[in-house]
């Protein structure tokens, strides 16, 4: 049986059940290389409390559809009066990066995971030439996730203080020059994740090979190498390589750009101080507030919730967007869709789409940017579920009793962007973390 998602096959992936202190290792095409789980385990559960391993999915007992992968075992589970076996179930949804498997829950018999990934899309528009896993768990099982830094087009310009060259990088995947053919990047070879531009020439100095690694609690490392043997004439016989170290800052701060810290014989070392390198719980909340020791800040957007059936309205030329954030009030146009953002076509108001649902909510404060994300909306033709990204700005003189109002700024591949100036986005900082 052919592997259902070949792009995901090259790696053993990890997911964590934080509540029960369990680490899962997942290999969807072969078996995980963990002796204690046996030779054919595709999903191996490592219970850190008891230091034991249990196979909860066998690679031989795999069944697949386009959006669901199930691994059975021969281990019976004691659900009263039934003959069930322990199994793992992975639901796949279209995403814009390779993404990460997320543990959802586990019953007596089934361990459930969800995975938003380019591999599950109906069209190839989000697929990279080369992409590697872009997250890691530290020794305390806290997730560090650089997926939000991945550029789907264009690249980051590294601060290298060399007037004659420019070094451009992407995170965990190659630079897509076709979707954003900036003049400098146009000459970059396909597949490169680190592109050195000298005058009108561009050189591949590194492609992603291995996934993100953690070297210390707040330092993550990504390595790129130039795969083909052909040496570049300015590298003194060495093969080019790029090492990017992502550093979680010791206190809350604005974002910085990646900086070149060392360069020798086409070996480039880059340091990037970014809060995305911090563990995810430091940056994100599933509610509309971020507060407490964990996050070093106090943010509460719950006063922006509208009651009594009213919504914020944002004009998007062809469409009107109705928003009701930080609550579970149905938007009337999007009745029964559980939408936090509802897109209505002006020329035909019967054409209504959920552009993100209120129970699929993430509030993120990272590198000085405050963002509220709603995902899991109605599908586009690519299979990607519509989502909305609301970027908040602090404005102590915002109208509408300080609440302000969202402004639609654009759409890219079924992701809708808004800006929102409000006094409730004014962040109160605490002490060090």
């Amino acid at each position: 049986q052919a592997a259902p998602f070949p792009e995901l096959c090259s790696y053993t992936w990890e997911a964590v059940d934080t509540k029960n202190n369990v680490l899962y290792k997942i290999n969807i095409c072969g078996s995980v290389d963990i002796v204690q789980c046996g030779p054919s385990s595709a999903v191996c559960m490592h219970d850190l409390k008891t230091r034991t391993y249990h196979s909860v999915g066998d690679s031989v007992l795999r069944s697949a559809t386009r959006s669901l992968l199930e691994f059975n075992t021969t281990v019976s589970c004691d659900q009263q009066g039934t003959n069930h076996r322990v199994q793992s179930s992975i639901a796949f949804l279209c995403g814009k990066t390779l993404g990460t498997p997320e543990f959802v829950t586990a019953t007596e018999c089934v361990h459930y995971f969800e995975w938003r990934t380019t591999a599950a899309c109906k069209k190839d528009i989000f697929k990279a030439n080369k992409e590697v896993p872009c997250y890691v768990f530290d020794e305390e099982l806290r997730k560090h996730d650089l997926n939000p830094l991945i550029k789907l087009s264009g690249a980051y310009d590294v601060d290298d203080s060399d007037p004659d060259t420019s070094l451009f990088i992407n995170v965990c995947r190659d630079i897509d020059t076709l979707r954003d053919p900036g003049s400098q990047l146009r000459a970059c070879p396909p597949g490169t994740a680190a592109c050195l531009v000298r005058g009108h020439q561009a050189f591949d100095v590194g492609q992603p090979r291995d996934g993100l690694k953690v070297v210390r609690k707040d330092r993550l490392v990504l390595s790129y190498v130039r795969e083909e043997a052909g040496k570049l004439d300015f590298c003194d016989g060495h093969s080019p390589a790029v090492t990017i170290t992502f550093v979680c800052p010791s206190e809350r701060r604005e974002g910085t750009i990646p900086k070149l810290t060392a360069k020798s014989n086409c070996r480039y070392e880059i340091e990037w101080i970014t809060e995305y390198a911090c563990h995810r719980d430091y940056l994100e909340s599933k509610t509309c507030s971020l507060s407490g020791e964990q996050q070093d800040v106090s943010i509460d957007l719950t006063p922006l919730a509208q009651s009594g059936g009213s919504s914020y309205i944002s004009d998007g030329k062809e469409y009107l967007f109705y928003l009701n954030v930080c609550g579970e009030t149905e938007i009337q146009f999007c009745n029964k869709k559980q939408a936090a953002v509802c897109q209505v076509k002006k020329s035909d108001t019967s054409q209504v789409k959920a552009a993100g649902r209120y129970h699929n909510q993430t509030l993120r404060y990272s590198d000085g940017d405050l963002t509220l994300i709603y995902f899991g909306g109605d599908e586009c033709s690519s299979g990607f579920q519509r989502m909305s990204v609301i970027n908040f700005e602090c404005n102590k003189t915002a109208g509408n009793d300080g609440k302000g109002t969202p402004v639609f700024t654009g759409e890219v591949d079924c992701t809708y962007f808004f800006t929102w100036d409000t006094e409730y986005a004014c962040v109160h900082h605490h002490h060090h973390h």
């Epitope: 509540k19 369990v22 829950t105 586990a106 007596e108």
Partner: nanobody, 116 residues
Framework: DVQLVESGGGLVQPGGSLRLSCAAS????????MDWYRQAPGKQREWVAT???????TYADSVKGRFTISRDNAKNTVYLQMNSLRPEDTAVYYC??????????WGQGTLVTVSS
């Protein structure tokens, strides 16, 4: 005050059965992962069974097919049903509760003796 109290231990013949109980107080019981451990005389404490907060269960190889862990959230109690007992199951049995927000909490233990 957070505490766990085990009961149900005693003397039983080989091949017999016992049901151990572990009553919890002072914690949101359903949020906690519950484990049973045991310590035989002169030996190290060993893990026996786990019932996670979501409901999945795992067992040590030595008790698989003979022991069953379960919980009653209404009674804040976790049980260990032990069938086909063997002399090597003789030990003090402890229950443990753990969650991301709490340090591990142990009970005081209950003695199980399997002897003819």
């Amino acid at each position: 005050d957070v505490q766990l109290v085990e009961s149900g231990g005693g003397l039983v013949q080989p091949g017999g059965s016992l049901r151990l109980s572990c009553a919890a107080s002072g914690i949101i019981f359903s949020d906690n992962r519950m484990d049973w451990y045991r310590q035989a005389p002169g030996k190290q404490r060993e893990w026996v069974a786990t019932l996670a907060s979501y409901g999945w269960k795992t067992y040590a190889d030595s008790v698989k097919g003979r022991f069953t862990i379960s919980r009653d959230n209404a009674k804040n109690t976790v049980y260990l049903q032990m069938n086909s007992l063997r002399p090597e199951d003789t030990a003090v049995y402890y229950c443990k509760a753990s969650s991301p927000v709490l340090n591990d909490i142990w009970g005081q233990g209950t003695l199980v003796t399997v002897s003819s």
